[in-house]
């Protein structure tokens, strides 16, 4: 039950995270005009990964796409790449994890296959989350660098008679969405990896051996221990007796075409 919950929760958290990464990537407010210590202007500038926008006080908003590929800063291209890789990996991870979910039954899929798929999707989510966090962090670092450079220009470029309004940019909403979404995807991935540990069957399946105790006839099956992977100690070892009532979580028999996870 705990495994199913962990896997299900990991899936949901990752789903929310990936949706957030997609939202952040599409958002226009990666950087927004810094209004502090600047004259009040009739326009508000903000920029995304794909276009820059200007909202006038009147409410009129105009956005222009970055129609050049070669003319864009390498850092921006890198951020775009990281976010897209994050989305692609996350989407594939979601697809894989749907089939790996313990609560979904597909034909005669073995537990080991589901465990492997859970682990694969978990790793994909982790990498996806890291890509998003890296992308957002690179962009944030770029903003900080540019902010201080333009601040320096504000105070050194006053020699002439004409002043200019130095448009400085600060963190936009998309950065925070990206960080949170990346974090959620990462957490979801870790949860999937943890769930995988409780899904995989024993590496060694022993043949059933009958032990005859005096007065009672019981069959002891060492292979009946709760499934465990090689990641850690088996904390739920339970002896299974023939003829006893067995719950799904308590028994792990040998896979057959009638077995569903």
């Amino acid at each position: 039950m705990a495994v199913t919950a962990c896997q299900g929760l990991g899936f949901v958290v990752s789903l929310i995270g990936i949706a957030g990464i997609i939202a952040a990537t599409c958002m226009d407010q990666w950087s927004t005009q810094d209004l502090y210590n600047n004259p009040v202007t009739a326009v508000f500038n903000y920029q995304g990964l794909w276009r820059s926008c200007v909202r006038e006080s009147s409410g009129f908003t105009e956005c222009r796409g970055y129609f050049t590929l070669l003319g864009l800063p390498a850092m921006l291209q890198a951020v775009r790449a990281l976010m897209i890789v994050g989305i692609v990996l996350g989407a594939i991870g979601l697809l894989v994890s749907i089939f790996a979910l313990k609560c979904i039954r597909i034909g005669s899929m073995e537990d080991s296959a589901k465990a492997n798929m859970t682990l694969t999707s978990g790793i994909m989510f982790i990498v996806s989350g890291l890509c998003a966090i890296a992308g957002v962090s690179v962009f944030a670092n770029m903003l900080v660098t540019n902010f201080w450079m333009s601040t320096a220009n504000m105070y050194t470029g006053m020699g002439g008679m004409v002043q200019t309004v130095q448009t400085r940019y600060t963190f936009g909403a998309a950065l925070f969405v990206g960080w949170v979404a990346g974090g959620l995807t990462l957490i979801g991935g870790v949860m999937m990896c943890i769930a995988c540990r409780g899904l995989a069957p024993e590496e060694t399946n022993y043949k059933a051996v009958s032990y005859h105790a005096s007065g009672h006839s019981v069959a002891y099956k060492p292979g009946g221990f709760k499934a465990s992977t090689g990641f850690g100690s088996n904390t739920k070892n339970k002896k299974i007796y023939d003829g006893g009532a067995r719950t799904e979580d308590e028994v792990q028999s040998y896979p057959s075409k009638h077995d569903y996870v």
Partner: antibody
Framework: QVQLKESGPGLVAPSQSLSITCTVS????????VHWIRQPPGKGLEWLGV???????NYNSALMSRLSISKDNSKSQVYLKMHSLQTDDTAMYYC???????????WGQGTALTVSS | DIVMTQSPSSLTVTPGEKVTMSCRSS????????????LSWYHQKPGQPPKLLIY???TRDSGVPVRFTGSGSGTDFTLTISSVQAEDLAVYYC?????????FGAGTKLELK
């Protein structure tokens, strides 16, 4: 067709208050900003302030302390209130609409105000 | 506040001639975000409210004759009337519509010779 029409008292005594109404027709006040501009006789134009579609305002810092702009969307009316009037407040008062940036594409005909005892 | 300086203060013209008037701002009206300069041109005839001719420094308002052309960027702007007509005789104002408080130039008066 967008139309703006100002109406005011015409004559006000010094140190008194002023209230001018701008009635807008042909368009909802929730879709654009309305500015107030004045022009003393034989002189240039002076921007007083603006109320935006959402209700936020900007004022001329020189007049901010005695100026207030409000509106009633249901009546399609914008109000300019000014207190402690002096003789140099004598001017033609215009209301105007802005669509792009802060350029004024539609103006009212203006209402003349004389501050005199 | 932004100071808008217009020159000349008055111009005497004959119908059909080309007229140029300039406007200088004490601070740049250029917005890097959309590569636009927020300056407008108006003309005002006696007893009438001003009429918008040009916004964003060079965009003609609807219904404005093509003989009116706005140019310039940043701090220096020009309004050109390619062939002056009798109905163009008016006072021309430039207007900073970028930085609050919004300000107008003192005007250039166009008179008939």
């Amino acid at each position: 067709q967008v139309q703006l029409k100002e109406s005011g008292p015409g004559l006000v005594a010094p140190s008194q208050s002023l209230s001018i109404t701008c009635t807008v027709s042909g368009l909802s006040l929730t879709s654009f900003g309305v500015h107030w501009i004045r022009q003393p006789p034989g002189k240039g134009l002076e921007w007083l302030g603006v109320i935006w579609a959402g209700g936020s305002t900007n004022y001329n810092s020189a007049l901010m302390s005695r100026l207030s702009i409000s509106k009633d969307n249901s009546k399609s009316q914008v109000y300019l209130k000014m207190h402690s009037l002096q003789t140099d407040d004598t001017a033609m008062y215009y209301c105007a609409r802005s669509l792009y940036g802060n350029s004024f594409d539609y103006w009212g005909q203006g209402t003349a105000l004389t501050v005199s005892s | 506040d932004i100071v808008m300086t217009q020159s000349p203060s008055s111009l005497t013209v004959t119908p059909g001639e080309k007229v140029t008037m300039s406007c200088r701002s004490s601070m740049s009206l250029f917005n890097s975000g959309n590569q636009k300069s927020y300056l407008s041109w108006y003309h005002q005839k006696p007893g009438q409210p001003p009429k918008l001719l040009i916004y964003w420094a060079s965009t003609r308002d609807s219904g404005v004759p093509v003989r009116f052309t706005g140019s310039g960027s940043g701090t220096d702007f020009t309004l050109t009337i390619s062939s002056v007509q009798a109905e163009d005789l008016a006072v021309y104002y430039c207007h900073n519509d970028y930085i609050y408080p919004l300000t107008f130039g003192a005007g250039t008066k166009l008179e008939l010779k």
